[in-house]
């Protein structure tokens, strides 16, 4: 468990950029947590390089990561989930670079799923619902969600709605009639835990009905 590399310690290693980033996922496999780290530079020669986390662990000093192709992974129950750990890139016993990381503040939730959109004719709106595995979790239960939708012809013109529940109503009059829309959702920790946006859910596509010119009402298509 060595500390930060001192200047002059690294010889040729100093020429390389070993900067890395990590994210945690809590209760991702039952009660097990995961911590995933990867080098920022995909071209780093990772032969003989290892990752190690020390501190803020339950009844152990340090844990070693498993190497899985381009990522380094730990699956464990041994995170205290408070305070800083020291994550180091190591070549043998030598630490090439280290950073202080609080596992509870680099949480990346699991992506939402089962996204669907139901048109409600009487209400002239669309009910958007989705699910998240975090409703069943002990820790990262409080999430903020970002629902993004766009007209399929508007390549980059995404509309965003932030919400804390898993239901959203889109008013029909705010959407173009007789058009196809793409919608997707992602989540970020709220409350005690902090971190990053999840991956996007798979997109869902829905069509808006045409407007009935006589009554001002619309017909779903």
């Amino acid at each position: 468990e060595s500390g930060y590399a001192q200047n002059g310690d690294l010889e040729d290693a100093e020429l390389d950029d070993y900067s890395f980033s990590c994210y945690s996922q809590l209760e991702v496999n039952g009660s097990q947590h995961s911590l995933t780290c990867a080098f920022e530079d995909p071209d780093v020669n990772t032969t003989n390089l290892e990752f190690e986390i020390c501190g803020a662990l339950v009844e152990v000093r340090c844990l070693n990561f498993r190497k899985l192709q381009e990522i380094y992974l730990i699956e464990t129950k041994k995170f205290l989930l408070i305070g800083n750990s020291n994550i180091c890139v190591k070549a043998g016993e030598k630490s090439l670079t280290c950073k202080n990381v609080n596992v509870a503040t680099i949480v990346k939730p699991e992506a939402p799923f089962d996204l669907s959109v139901i048109y409600r004719e009487g209400a002239n709106d669309f009910l958007v619902t989705f699910n998240t595995s975090h409703l069943q979790k002990k820790y990262v239960k409080v999430l903020m969600h970002d629902v993004a939708y766009r007209h399929e012809k508007d390549e980059n013109n995404w509309m965003h709605v932030n919400l804390s529940s898993t239901k959203l109503t889109l008013l029909q009059r705010k959407l173009q009639p007789k058009a196809t829309y793409e919608i997707k959702v992602r989540s970020i920790p709220g409350d005690y835990f902090k971190g990053f946006w999840s991956e996007w859910s798979p997109s869902y596509y829905f069509r808006t009905p045409e407007i009935n010119n006589h009554s001002g009402e619309t017909n779903p298509t």
Epitope: G55, L57, R61, G83, N84, N86, N102, Y192
Partner: antibody
């Protein structure tokens, strides 16, 4: 101001259990670990264990594992240390200490609770 | 488990003198902390993360070191500095050294 106030002195018989409380004030109780450190008469300091008040996760010194139990009540910002199967060499001053999670040092200490184990 | 050995066990000095206290670890550690304890009182933090002064600690206290060897220095002893000093390492099981008593010569 930040303060840890511990319960009063205890006298126990060998084989009994003791439960010491530590009431925190002046800070967010769930934001820092609570540690327990003991000091036998004329001796040095010995870390016993810690609890994360937010989730109740504990980490114990192997020397005390199975005999010490750390708990907390977040509604009253109080941590507890229970030591069972007491022996005469458990006679000591028991301190609670707030853990600074950035550097893992104990930045605020309780006043100490004297536990005497004697038949 | 890492063992921290403090030396000397007792340091006899006069007010105004410089005190140098050592803490040696059985293996390399990342951070070392120092505490002061007076009779009948709880320990109080002096130095954290090797060299940072804890809140309210005067600048005559300083810390240094890396790897396995760490030092607490009191540049000029004041009467209130005569006490026992403990080093402690940052990681599980948060081991303390045996202490160095700084006494009046």
């Amino acid at each position: 101001q930040v303060q840890l106030v511990q319960s009063g002195a205890e006298v126990k018989k060998p084989g009994a259990s003791v439960k010491v409380s530590c009431k925190a004030s002046g800070y967010t109780f769930t934001g820092y670990t609570m540690n327990w450190v003991r000091q036998a008469p004329g001796q040095g300091l010995e870390w016993m264990g810690l609890i994360n008040p937010y989730n109740g996760v504990t980490s114990y010194n192997q020397k005390f594992k199975g005999r010490v139990t750390l708990t907390r009540d977040t509604s009253i910002s109080t941590a507890y240390m229970e030591l069972s199967r007491l022996r005469s060499d458990d006679t000591a001053v028991y301190y609670c200490a707030r853990g600074d999670g950035n550097y893992w040092y104990f930045d605020v200490w309780g006043q100490g609770t004297t536990v005497t184990v004697s038949s | 488990e890492i063992v921290l050995t403090q030396s000397p066990a007792t340091l006899s000095l006069s007010p105004g003198e410089r005190a140098t206290l050592s803490c040696s670890a059985s293996s390399s550690v990342t951070y070392m902390h120092w505490y002061q304890q007076k009779p009948g009182q709880a320990p109080r933090p002096l130095i954290y993360e090797i060299s940072k002064l804890a809140s309210g600690i005067p600048a005559r206290f300083s810390g240094s070191g890396s790897g396995t060897d760490f030092t607490l220095t009191i540049s000029s002893l004041e009467p209130e500095d005569f006490a026992v000093y403990y080093c402690q390492e940052w990681n599980y099981p948060y081991t303390f050294g045996g202490g160095t008593k700084v006494e009046i010569k």
